[in-house]
């Protein structure tokens, strides 16, 4: 969470952003509020990138103004132009990609003053995992997959009766990239399971974390999947 | 409401340089969150973006046309135009303009089109 | 650049019918699809952005679906008006490609 405030004469306004991070491929939204303004057509919204001449988005007397805006950003981005009253300043963007991550820098000027506040953007791919029980194996094994995920990620299996022992043993691991040669998939499988027993597979990179767990019994399978993003907020 | 007419010749000869006009009407071509898209359409055939335009100028293009393709904007007449050079036969089409949405990008609305045909 | 397939080619419908069409993008395109109608001799109509919001003035009995890589449109009860050819558009990335349509004709 950033809180920036900005002087203009003896008005200032608090603009706050939020750390937040983009799955590539898809669409994301960079987060930024700002004191509401009634007044719609004072409000000046631009969206800046570190590194970047141009601007990534521009909002201004109720309408997007892109005609100063960087090529790597041209089609890709809008913002909530029915919220922006109410003080959402955040922007969409499309096809989110590798080289969009970095520092933003939203920036406001309404009729009550200015300000602005930076936002870290990460980039990467990260999805939920599958368990399932691999039935072709020679011995009883569970199957983790989850389809994209960059940068690397680790891999750790856990167990609620075996609990705080060490499965790299008993466990393979691959990945397996992409077609579009940024992204990779990843298969853990998991050997010499038990019954009446709940594992957990557990992948994480510096972006995102996401838990498969599965419950198998004699007579069902239970699976239940999260997935956390890490250092947002 | 918004509307957009094509004008242009209907025929020309092969190895030179096709040009058409849109107008738009109803609305301004200032107006900050479209793009002015190209679209055309071979008979009997699909459809194929040709590129866009921003009221600044600025524009992209279709990679597979880029080499033939000049899209440019007047907005004192509130006009944008399309230029492909080196025709063959292989363009003959109904070319239609559109706005596009600047994202969504969306066509809407569409021109009623105009059939050029490329034969000498 | 994306490809975009759309199925079946043609579709047989008898009037009051419900017709469901297939788009299917190359690689995920989220939900950066548009659908258009076209009759003959006429331009193309937005009916569909955002893989399933109406467009201003279209019919409820439209509606799209689906989401990456696998889209439908949908027509609850076919309307004589409906006889048409229907296009699905990605966004998602440039260049902006189309697919061959569908045909849906009267049974």
């Known amino acids: 969470l950033i809180i920036g405030f900005g002087i203009s004469g003896k008005h200032f306004i608090t603009v706050t952003t939020f750390t937040s991070a983009g799955n590539i491929g898809e669409d994301g939204t960079l987060s930024c509020t700002f004191e509401p303004d009634i007044k719609l057509n004072g409000i000046v919204i631009q969206w800046l990138k570190e590194g970047i001449k141009g601007l990534v988005h521009e909002f201004k007397e109720g309408k997007d103004d892109l005609s100063q805006q960087h090529e790597m950003f041209r089609g890709r981005t809008a913002v909530f132009a029915d919220q922006v009253v109410v003080g959402n300043a955040s922007l969409r963007l499309k096809n989110v990609q590798l080289t969009d991550a970095g520092t933003y820098t939203c920036y406001i000027r309404t009729s009550k003053g200015k300000g602005n506040a930076n936002l870290e953007y990460k980039t990467g791919a990260f999805s939920m995992p599958e368990i399932n029980v691999d039935y072709n194996a020679s011995s009883e094994s569970l199957r983790c997959e989850a389809p994209r995920w960059f940068p690397q990620p680790t891999v750790a299996w856990a167990s609620q009766v075996d609990q705080g022992a060490n499965f790299s043993e008993v466990s393979n691991t691959s990945f397996e990239l992409n077609s579009e040669n940024v992204t990779m998939k990843v298969v853990s499988v998991l050997y010499n399971v038990t019954i009446n027993n709940t594992y957990s597979c557990m992948i994480e990179n510096d972006i995102a974390k996401a838990t498969g767990d599965i419950k198998v019994t004699d007579s069902e399978v239970k699976r239940r999947s999260q997935l956390q993003l890490l250092n947002s907020g | 409401q918004l509307q957009l007419q094509e004008s242009g010749p209907g025929l020309v000869k092969p190895s030179e340089t096709l040009s058409l006009t849109c107008t738009v009407s109803g609305g301004s071509i200032k107006s900050g969150s479209y793009y002015w898209g190209w679209i055309r359409q071979p008979p009997g055939k699909g459809l194929e973006w040709i590129g866009n335009?921003?009221?600044?100028?600025?524009?992209y293009y279709n990679p597979s046309l880029k080499s033939r393709v000049t899209i440019s904007v007047d907005t004192s007449k509130n006009q944008f135009s399309l230029k492909l050079s080196s025709v063959t036969a292989a363009d003959t089409a109904v070319y239609y303009c559109a706005r596009e949405g600047s994202y969504p990008n969306q066509f809407d609305p569409w021109g009623q089109g105009i059939l050029v045909t490329v034969s000498s | 650049e994306i490809v975009m397939t759309q199925s079946p080619a043609t579709l047989s419908v008898s009037p009051g019918e419900r017709a469901t069409l297939s788009c299917r993008a190359s690689?995920?395109?989220?939900?950066?699809l548009a659908w258009y109608q076209q009759k003959p001799g006429q331009a193309p109509r937005l009916l569909i952005y955002g893989a399933s919001t109406r467009a201003t003035g279209i019919p409820a009995r439209f509606s799209g679906s689906g989401s990456g890589t696998e889209f439908t449109l949908t027509i609850s009860s076919l309307q004589s008006e409906d006889f048409a050819v229907y296009y699905c558009?990605?966004?998602?990335?440039?260049?902006?490609?189309f697919g061959g349509g569908t045909k849906v004709e009267i049974k």
């Open positions: 690689q995920s395109v989220s939900s950066n």
């Open positions: 335009i921003y009221y600044s100028g600025s524009t």
């Open positions: 558009q990605q966004y998602h990335s440039f260049p902006f490609t």
